[in-house]
Interface confidence: low
């Protein structure tokens, strides 16, 4: 009996394509699951087989490669739609096999509709531009392999619903869109429409991405701890609740991991035999600078706890900082009848 390595339904690859546009979908086996490529597999005598399950159906069926004008075809490890139809939505499986070896994976393909302003259920990639950073470009994505280099397509860029022409700081340059200087006002969805001829027909590729203007690395600083600080003393009596916020500002940094943590007497709170809870909240500015607050809480503080060292730490790609909170045991106010009277020598 032959072992078929069934990778199941690869939901990580939620492929979405626009209705009535060409789509080329590579078999994910060679991109994510196997260590060899299609050419190696093919030369080893392995065959790639495609089949699909229509939306809301359980029946696996072969793909009809004999449609008029070769609407669906396969070329090496690529499944082609020229163009897609709404009812092409379903789960597609590519299977690599010969008499002794078998490996397959399924993936969902969703054909979506768009309106005249390019709005659709499509999940959009996000491209981050640095604020006021000089010339930056975005490139029309995922158009490689649709037409040979000898074909010169026409490319039209839109911001939202509007064709980009005579914009102050945004200039279309073929497949690229150049931002001479990026401002918050440049946030939004940008669409390129690529039009190219093939075998006497004209095809359109629509690609939309979201531009988000973020803090510039020129302005980035190490984490800044706003709290605890030298101006606030946490003075508590035993039995009271101790609440210390650690509030840290992080400049936006591409791919930086921002971290905030507390230590108590130099140890992580989990390693201390006291009942500590820590709650975190995160907020972002318009340019994705981040403020993280971690509130350290001890419900019923003891006099021992009030002698401990509480230090807030923060780290980003720009550096690491730490700040200790000033924690004291409150000296109880004297009760006049006993303590004060004794102070005046009363008997």
């Amino acid at each position: 009996s032959e072992r078929c390595d069934d990778w199941g339904l690869d939901t990580m690859r939620q492929i979405q394509v626009f209705e009535d546009e060409p789509a080329r979908i590579k078999c994910p086996l060679f991109e994510h699951f196997l260590k060899f490529n299609y050419s190696t597999a093919h030369s080893a005598g392995l065959t790639l087989i495609w089949y699909w399950t229509r939306q809301d159906r359980d029946l696996e069926e072969p793909i009809n490669f004999r449609l008029p004008e070769n609407r669906i075809s396969k070329e090496k490890d690529v499944l082609w739609f020229r163009p897609t139809l709404l009812n092409d939505t379903g789960n597609y499986t590519c299977m690599l096999r010969n008499t002794t070896y078998c490996s397959k994976v399924a993936f969902p393909l969703e054909v979506v509709q768009k309106d005249s302003c390019f709005n659709s259920p499509m999940k959009l990639p996000v491209h981050k531009l640095y604020i006021e950073y000089g010339i930056q470009r975005i490139t029309c994505p995922n158009v490689d392999g649709y037409f040979p280099s000898s074909v010169k397509p026409t490319i039209t860029w839109y911001m939202g619903c509007y064709k980009i022409q005579n914009f102050n700081n945004v200039i279309p340059e073929g497949m690229n869109l150049s931002f001479l200087i990026a401002f918050i006002s440049n946030n939004g969805n940008y669409t390129c429409v690529v039009t190219y001829p093939e075998n006497g027909r004209t095809f359109h590729l629509t690609r939309t991405l979201t531009v988000k203007v973020v803090g510039s690395p020129k302005n980035a600083v190490p984490p800044v701890i706003h709290s605890p600080n030298d101006h606030v003393v946490y003075e508590k009596e035993p039995g009271e609740e101790l609440l210390i916020p650690c509030t840290v500002y992080f400049s936006f940094l591409m791919d930086s991991r921002n971290e905030v943590w507390w230590t108590i007497d130099g140890k992580k709170p989990d390693d201390i035999p006291i009942d500590v809870t820590i709650n975190e909240s995160i907020s972002h500015s318009r340019t994705e600078d981040e403020t993280r607050t971690q509130i350290l809480s001890i419900k019923k503080v003891t006099s021992e706890d009030l002698k401990r060292s509480y230090v807030c730490h923060a780290r980003s790609a720009k550096g690491e900082v730490a700040k200790a909170a000033t924690v004291k045991q409150k000296v109880p106010a004297p009760r006049y009848t006993v303590e004060l009277a004794c102070g005046f020598g009363a008997t």
């Epitope: 072992r3 990778w7 199941g8």
Partner: antibody, heavy 119, light 108 residues
Framework: QVQLLQSGAEVKKPGSSVKVSCKAS????????IDWVRQAPGQGLEWMGG????????NSAQKFQGRVTITADKSTNTAYMELSSLRSEDTAVYYC????????????WGQGTMVTVSS | EIVLTQSPGTLSLSPGERATLSCRAS???????LAWFQQRPGQAPRLLIY???RRATGIPDRFSGSGSGTDFTLTISRLEPEDFAVYYC?????????FGGGTKVEIK
Amino acid sequence: QVQLLQSGAEVKKPGSSVKVSCKASGGTFNIYAIDWVRQAPGQGLEWMGGIIPIFGTANSAQKFQGRVTITADKSTNTAYMELSSLRSEDTAVYYCARNGATSDAFDIWGQGTMVTVSS
Amino acid sequence: EIVLTQSPGTLSLSPGERATLSCRASQSVSSNYLAWFQQRPGQAPRLLIYGVSRRATGIPDRFSGSGSGTDFTLTISRLEPEDFAVYYCQQYGSSPLTFGGGTKVEIK
């Protein structure tokens, strides 16, 4: 570096079941197959079956079908092999091994779990 | 199932000598999915060669694999004291995955 750590030795009565665990640490667990191989004392290696944790897809050698259950818990990076209706000839060291990628070789092995079946 | 036959059963050699181990398959091994393992007493097997001839990470270049179809060979160019062990071939191209019976390389 990925390591596979197996549960300790077991002594079982004929007719009972044994469940051996294999915990992966230090690397990606889900996308690789974890296979089970056994070795009777003084004998060679025998493949029992395997599972790809990310999909829960298990398969086993015909010889063990109906007696072996291979599962995986993605949350703890642990694979399990349960063998039922034990007989004395099931006395062996049971190894888990990571299948480097689809139809690739067993590149990382657990330390082995000795299972003794005796009345 | 694919039956793998290893020969010889035992190979008696001295350190520094060349060892040639054979593995014959009852039918063609799919896509050359053939591996070699070394097993020392009391230890788990260790991958030496996969895909017939590709050395696994950290394996010294005195170990080499060759062959295709149904006939495969593991060669150890100069035996070191730590190389005396049992060697298994395995095909991992079709189910059930199968191992050869092993070749013991012992000190002469």
